[in-house]
Interface confidence: low
């Protein structure tokens, strides 16, 4: 008779990413006996929750349970029933909830309370819902991509398992763009930091890493657009806003009350002689770029070098993985190829933004108009953020790799978060003490 392999002891974990624009549920699995090895955890499922981000449920908390049902039921199906009780579930909320908490701690707490009560009803091992800090978001994203790229493994491979993987153990920097915040995280050349707030030290698999990280709240693509509109409407002579960041022929009515709902636009808020205004697209990349640059205060820097708004940024070092909305937007625009130079990207953006709205709608008939209309702004914003915000140049552009998935797992903070909370990243190369959660706080 044929030898039958013993059934592998598989473990599962669930992380919900409660972002500003939507919530996604990720299911991870790994062989139990290898849980301290690097690169063994992988994603088996992503379930996108229908609806907006949880912060939008502040006035209708009673609907949160229904909102989460489909994806939690999907997790019930994917994970074998025998494993349910030992499968940890974590929910991390990011900048959308940070903004809500800025407005009202009580309301943010109320949303999280209802989320926790809803998730506790499932047969999994629910470990809590919390608003993670921007620093954590950056750090966990960095851990995720380097874990998936095999950068923490001491065994150098003679082959490359992913296109970006080189045999050297130099870590990749992480560039994360969400709807409400953006993070930059990397190991700078110089280990001394001028800004302790932006410094993280941790030991992973026997090696020490001194990491720079910063999260820019209000500089995710959606909040940046609100900021830009609030800034530009200040100088509009009437209730028409001729906007270079939208395609020629595009028209949309915006309520002033919606514009000023977010704390991100408070700095531009003023009494306007109208309740609504109409965006009229003129589709000019250069003008859009100029308008976006006005969101970055680069006139003030108390350090040797800054990104913007007086935030320290050391000289860029090494390769970077750009994921989340960096990838989604650039992938839509077909600009993720390593061969596309920065000059070419700019040229393509100029061409794209100047295309008439009717033409764009016809070319991308399957795409929701709300999203479709914003790609010109988002693409321009990404270029402005990377070039003027983070000081990438035409030369260093080739060190940016737009990454959606690595080895079938989404690039993002959720995997790193789970690895840390389940103590699956040992500090030492053999099996030794796990990285403590307090490293990030």
């Amino acid at each position: 008779t044929q030898n039958k392999a013993l059934p592998e002891n598989i473990k599962y974990g669930i992380v919900l990413d409660a972002g500003s624009s939507h919530t996604s549920l990720y299911i991870y699995k790994w062989p139990a006996e290898k849980e301290n090895d690097t690169g063994v955890v992988h994603q088996v499922e992503e379930c996108r929750v229908k609806g907006p981000g949880i912060s939008k449920y502040v006035q209708k908390v009673n609907e949160i349970g229904i909102y989460l049902t489909d994806c939690m039921e999907r997790a019930r199906e994917v994970i074998p029933r025998s494993q349910h009780q030992e499968t940890p579930v974590y929910l991390g909320a990011t900048a959308g909830m940070r903004l809500l908490r800025m407005e009202s701690e009580e309301l943010a707490d109320r949303v999280l309370d209802v989320v926790e009560r809803s998730l506790s009803n499932y047969p999994f091992d629910f470990q809590g819902a919390r608003i993670i800090t921007g620093q954590e978001e950056g750090a966990y994203g960095w851990i995720t991509i380097n874990y998936l790229l095999g950068k923490f493994s001491q065994k150098t491979r003679w082959f490359s398992i992913v296109p970006y993987e080189t045999n050297n153990q130099e870590t990749f920097g992480a560039l994360d763009l969400g709807g409400a915040s953006t993070q930059i995280t990397f190991v700078p050349q110089n280990q001394t930091t001028e800004s302790p707030d932006n410094a993280l030290q941790f030991r992973l698999y026997g090696k020490d890493y001194n990491v720079y990280t910063h999260s820019f709240l209000c500089y995710g693509k959606d909040q940046a657009l609100w900021q830009k509109l609030a800034k530009d409407i200040q100088v509009a002579s009437n209730e028409i806003l001729r906007d270079p960041c939208f395609h020629p022929g595009y028209k949309k009515v915006v309520n002033v009350s919606d514009l000023y709902k977010t704390p991100c636009t408070k700095r531009f808020e003023m009494t306007l002689p109208f309740q609504q205004f109409e965006i009229q697209g003129i589709g000019n990349y250069q003008q859009c770029h100029q308008s976006v640059l006005e969101l970055f205060n680069t006139s003030y820097c108390p350090y040797s070098q800054c990104a913007f708004n007086g935030i320290f940024l050391p000289p860029l070092q090494g390769d970077f993985g750009a994921f989340s909305a960096f990838y989604f937007v650039m992938n839509f625009l077909n600009l993720t190829s390593e061969k596309v130079s920065q000059e070419k990207v700019t040229e393509m953006m100029k061409k794209f933004c100047s295309q008439p709205w009717e033409e764009i709608k016809t070319s991308y008939a399957g795409v929701k108009e709300k999203y479709l209309s914003e790609y010109c702004f988002s693409g321009t914003y990404i270029l402005s953020l990377l070039l003027q915000g983070y000081h990438f140049t035409a030369d260093s552009w080739e060190h940016i790799h737009f990454i959606g998935k690595i080895q079938g797992s989404d690039a993002g903070w959720t995997l790193g978060y789970m690895l840390n909370l389940t103590n699956m990243i040992p500090a030492e190369q053999p099996l030794s003490t796990p990285l403590s959660h307090s490293t990030y706080v």
């Epitope: 800025m102 407005e103 921007g134 620093q135 707030d197 910063h214 709240l217 704390p263 408070k266």
Partner: antibody, heavy 119, light 109 residues
């Protein structure tokens, strides 16, 4: 140019209440969090609380929680601070001040209202 | 409440450097932003903002004033000091609502 103009000086008896107004011109009060700060003669600044006129949400310092009420009237662009059960220690200059988003530049202060509590 | 402790008084000659310190009993950093502000108050006047977010100079304030620090230790520096700088100086945190330090009286010799 934004200006905050407060109501005039008041003399009150212990146990009474006082209501101080702060009228904002040059911008809408809904653009700000409006704070109240007081200063007893020869003493330092003491934060009393704030109101977000956009949502009528208030936050009060623990010390004043049971005695202070902050309100706003967007039609007249005015905020109010009422302090009840007055005692002699409440004799102070009361200031209103603006804040755009917590932690960002506090742009403007009122000229102050002297409240004297004396029997 | 976050308690702020300031050095009570300081006497300094014109042209010299004045350094005022403020210590908070817990961090006033939040999301990478430091919610510490500094005010100047002269007799009979409302406070005037000098520095916000720990080190940003408020509009119209001379560059002689500068702020530094993060976490729990902060400094306001006046360099060089002028006769007109005689005043009370207050630190204020706005990370968790507002609280003020007790004030530092600066006298010009």
């Amino acid at each position: 140019q934004v200006q905050l103009v407060q109501s005039g000086a008041e003399v009150k008896k212990p146990g009474a209440s006082v209501k101080v107004s702060c009228k904002v011109s040059g911008d809408s009060i809904t653009a700000y969090f409006m704070h109240w700060v007081r200063q007893a003669p020869g003493k330092g600044l003491e934060w009393m609380g704030r109101i977000d006129p956009d949502h009528e949400r208030t936050k009060y310092a623990e010390k004043f929680k049971n005695r202070v009420t902050m309100t706003s009237d967007t039609s007249t662009n005015t905020v109010y601070m009422e302090l009840s059960s007055l005692r002699s220690e409440d004799t102070a200059v009361y200031y209103c001040a603006t804040e755009r988003v917590p932690g960002f530049e506090t742009d403007y202060w009122g000229q102050g209202t002297m409240v004297t509590v004396s029997s | 409440d976050i308690v702020l402790t300031q050095s009570p008084a300081l006497a300094v000659s014109p042209g010299q450097r004045a350094t005022i310190t403020c210590r908070t009993q817990q961090t006033v950093d939040h999301y990478g932003t430091t919610y510490m502000n500094w005010y100047q108050q002269k007799p009979g006047q409302p406070p005037k903002l000098l520095i916000y977010l720990a080190s940003s100079l408020a509009s119209g304030v001379p560059a002689r004033f500068s702020g530094s620090g993060s976490g729990t230790d902060f400094t306001l520096t006046i360099n060089p000091v002028e006769a007109d700088d005689t005043a009370n100086y207050y630190c204020q945190q706005s990370r968790n609502l507002w609280t003020f330090g007790g004030g530092t009286k600066v006298e010009i010799k």
